[in-house]
Interface confidence: low
């Protein structure tokens, strides 16, 4: 299953199938989740090692039992990939790392006047992989407001470098952030030239596309199709790259296929996984396991469920049958595509799924209406659980904020329904961060079921918690996924990195914001939030945020929007926006319910509504 | 010039047999995996039978699982139908085409030939 | 097996028109979405292939989009001869299967 935990102090003795420069144990762990056999990770930063030369050193690993060893190691950190993890499967990575120079391939130089500019360049130019900005305090005048995109040939850098005054972080084209646009098409009996970065066997073009899209240096392809003249080159897909970003020429050849990475596309990229099965075929590779199950999508779930599992082959022959059971053979390979594909065969074959980022159909766990108020804009993919609740009457209005936590379910506030509890007038857009793009013509959920905690009682500040069952099933994107629930009545983690976010008033007597606003605001004790509020009970099932001096708070339109917190490296939700004192008010923090306390219930009523276990745990 | 070319069908009475061809031209049959489609009068396009390119694998739909067989000859460049214990609901035009098996679409198809099933 | 729904069954447009024609599958099928045409007393005709792809000699008026369950073909600029029944086709797994068929007529 997902393993989500990460060890400090601990370094895995053993297993290293490959070794890289990442700035933190996060992006450690994300090469680890896309390195075909990587289950486990290691990551050294700079103040664990005096040795310069395995400074911000990651270090994969593989094992045949899952584990390895662990040695202790001050200031090391540890942990598993996240295959098998769903929805937070992803390889967009945003943070900016300030004083560290990420070292690379230098290929081009300019002044812009913020590192958030420079990541921007480097998201809108083809060869960018990171980049390194010198702020106007850089100790060397000339290169003061310097924006250097680089690239280098793992995609990783090949230094990283404490050093003052610089901040580094990586281009947001996994993010499907980049302005480049990208070219979906096929080209039929069409050979690309230029220099191969890498040699794969792929069943079809559109399995060598997504692999290129993933692949550090791979810009366009050219797969050879089973039906090409030269036998040992049959289902080869080449991965290409060229000096320009583009081919330099094409020449017709019948049976190939070529076409582009799909990583400069906008808002949307494929996912990092194959779902389809190819009837007829074989995949062959290093045997990892074989059992005997009946049909060949149990053998592909047994593979998604065999975490070393790549691919599989299901066998109808009829010596590997017995009754309605078939063997099926796990196999995996040293770069995760078969070895050799055989045509015209007794068997079906396909790939695993652990790297679909879609996951089951699950919400994720780990073991007086009020918005934002002092604020800034978000970006696109920030918050990607974030949805707006809106009603349909005369007119069309957002009203409250609510946060996805799986396909098919929203957690908010109860207090949003107070007086308009039937569901047809309601309409929930997710994925969006403009509420002006929202035209007649924005897809949007309708609601199936809305279930008001049974203790809630309107105008009373208790138990102001909801779920929403959506009719449909939305699929996961960048800019649409769900928020990691907490583990039941999580008292003992201390968070300091929390935000709040709505589209909710500006101001006290303001109105609803076209961008999605955030907010870091930092928790507050219960016994202090009870001082500030000595009319209203503060029960533990509420959790307090706020600055003492005011100025930056949830108001009216933020009621049911998420407080998250990040901890590990991972999102939670701690809070769902409820009520307060005004907006900002100094002394007067908002009031919050704490979804940790309201596990037990969040779990009854996702499983009992369609009788199947809906929670997942990534701990 | 890719062709195929059916031929076989006719009028048979139900219960009765039929042996369909096809012959392929204009491309080297042997590397491509060969599908049979049929269109009953007025009606929509329903998948029959596929067959690999070298003849090893053979796929059925469950309505003529038992009484058809799929079959090929690469060194005559030719496609086969034999349809055995025909019905009235076999009634239609049959057509080959050529599965793109890297891209699962069928680019190239016969004219058709239609097969009654009548008493 | 996998059920493809299209809609609408016919379809009325005058030449120069847009038409529009959807398929719905009914489990995830990826990319793996075919459109064909085909006249009366004629064999069908590839138009698109992979949800989008054009196939070679097929006019640029004709695109298709979607992915997953959701499909759609987009005839824009309707000429004399696009007139003709519109077939949907999931390629993702045996048994292949087909739509129901969309007749464009002209109005």
């Known amino acids: 299953g997902c393993l989500t935990q990460l060890y400090e102090n601990a370094f895995f003795r053993g297993g290293d199938v490959a070794s890289m420069y990442t700035p933190n144990a996060q992006y450690c762990q994300m090469r680890c989740t896309f390195h075909p056999r990587c289950l486990l990770f290691s990551f050294l930063p700079a103040s664990s090692i005096n040795d310069m030369e395995k400074r911000f050193g990651c270090f994969l690993k593989d094992s045949v039992t899952g584990t390895l060893p662990k040695v202790h190691r001050t200031g090391a950190v540890s942990g598993h990939s996240l295959k098998q993890c769903g929805h937070q499967i992803s390889a967009c990575h945003r943070d900016i790392y300030k004083g560290v120079d990420m070292r690379g391939v230098n290929f081009n130089v300019s002044k812009v006047s913020s590192v958030e500019e420079c990541q921007k360049r480097c998201t809108s130019n083809i060869r960018c992989q990171f980049f390194s900005y010198a702020t106007q305090t850089f100790h060397k005048a000339e290169y003061r407001n310097n924006c250097l995109l680089k690239y280098s040939p793992g995609g990783t850098p090949t230094a990283i470098k404490v050093l003052s005054n610089v901040e580094s972080g990586f281009s947001l084209k996994p993010c499907a952030l980049s302005e480049i646009g990208c070219h979906m098409n096929i080209f039929q009996h069409l050979a690309f030239s230029d220099v191969d970065v890498a040699r794969v066997l792929t069943p079809d073009a559109f399995v060598c596309r997504t692999i290129c899209t993933y692949h550090p240096n791979c810009l366009f392809f050219t797969f050879y199709t089973n039906v090409w003249k030269i036998e040992s080159q049959r289902n080869v897909c080449l991965l290409k790259t060229s000096e320009s970003g583009t081919p330099s020429s094409s020449t017709p050849q019948e049976n190939t296929i070529s076409g582009y990475s799909l990583l400069t596309c906008k808002r949307t990229l494929p996912e990092p996984c194959h779902s389809k099965i190819y009837p007829g075929v074989d995949f062959g590779g290093e045997e990892l396991n074989v059992t005997f199950v009946k049909g060949v999508n149990v053998c592909q779930e047994t593979c998604t469920k065999m975490i070393r599992c790549q691919f599989f082959t299901y066998s109808l022959l009829p010596e590997d049958c017995k009754e309605e059971k078939c063997k099926c053979f796990l196999r995996l390979s040293m770069d995760g595509s078969p070895t050799r594909i055989a045509y015209g065969t007794q068997g079906s074959s396909g790939y695993s799924l652990r790297l679909c980022n879609t996951g089951d159909n699950s919400v994720c766990t780990t073991k007086t209406s009020t918005r934002i108020v002092g604020g800034t804009n978000s970006s696109w993919g920030e918050w990607p659980w974030q949805v707006s609740l809106q009603v349909k009457l005369t007119a069309q209005r957002h009203l409250c904020g609510g946060s996805l936590i799986g396909h098919q379910w929203v957690l908010t506030a109860a207090h949003c329904f107070d007086g308009l509890p039937l569901q047809d007038v309601w309409r929930i857009y997710s994925g969006i961060l403009n509420l002006s793009d929202i035209t007649k013509d924005t897809p949007f959920s309708q609601i199936k079921e809305i279930i008001i905690h049974q203790n809630y009682k309107v105008s009373e500040g208790n138990h102001d918690i909801a779920l929403i069952k959506l009719q449909a099933p939305l699929n996961y994107t960048e800019f649409q996924k769900p928020i990691c629930l907490p583990s039941k009545g999580d008292t003992s983690t201390i968070y300091t990195n929390c935000w709040v976010t709505g589209w909710g008033f500006s101001k006290e007597k303001g109105e609803i914001q076209n961008i999605l606003q955030k907010v870091n605001i930092p928790l507050v004790t219960n016994e202090e939030c009870q001082k500030r509020y000595q009319d209203y009970k503060i029960t533990q099932r509420m959790v307090c945020a706020g600055y003492k001096e005011g100025g930056k708070d949830a108001c009216k339109g933020d009621s049911g929007g998420p407080l998250v917190c990040k901890h590990n490296g991972m999102w939670r939700l701690v809070g769902i926006t409820s009520w307060g004192e005004g907006c900002a008010r100094r002394e007067q923090p908002g009031v919050y319910t704490k979804v940790a306390e309201y596990m037990d219930w969040i779990l009854e009523k996702t499983q009992s509504s369609d009788g199947k276990a809906q929670m997942q745990s990534p701990a | 010039e890719v062709q195929l070319l059916e031929s076989g069908g006719g009028l048979v009475q139900p219960g009765g047999s039929l042996r369909l061809s096809c012959a392929a031209s204009g491309f080297t049959f042997s590397f491509y995996k060969m599908i049979w489609v049929r269109q009953a009068p007025g009606k929509g396009l329903e998948w029959v039978s596929s067959?690999?390119?070298?003849?090893?694998?053979?796929q059925y739909a469950d309505s003529v699982k038992g009484r058809f067989t799929i079959s090929r000859d690469n060194s005559k460049n030719t496609l086969y139908l034999q349809m055995n214990s025909l019905r009235a609901e076999d009634t239609a035009v049959y057509y080959c085409?050529?599965?793109?098996?890297?891209?699962?679409?069928?680019?190239?198809w016969g004219q058709g030939t239609l097969v009654t099933v009548s008493s | 097996d996998i059920q493809m729904t299209q809609s609408p069954s016919s379809l009325s447009s005058s030449v120069g028109d847009s038409a529009t024609i959807t398929c719905r599958a009914s489990?995830?099928?990826?990319?793996?979405l075919n459109w064909y045409q085909q006249k009366p007393g004629k064999a069908p005709k590839i138009l698109i292939y992979?949800?989008?792809q054009l196939e070679s000699g097929v006019p640029s008026r004709f695109s298709g989009s979607g992915s997953g369950t959701d499909f759609t073909l987009t005839v824009s600029g309707l000429q004399p001869e696009d007139f003709a029944t519109y077939w949907c086709?999931?390629?993702?797994?045996?048994?292949?299967?087909f739509g129901q068929g969309t007749k464009l007529e002209i109005k």
């Open positions: 085409a050529r599965d793109r098996v890297d891209l699962g679409y069928l680019d190239y």
């Open positions: 067959i690999s390119s070298s003849g090893g694998s053979t």
């Open positions: 086709q999931q390629s993702y797994n045996v048994p292949y299967t």
């Open positions: 489990q995830s099928i990826s990319i793996y």
């Open positions: 992979g949800a989008s």
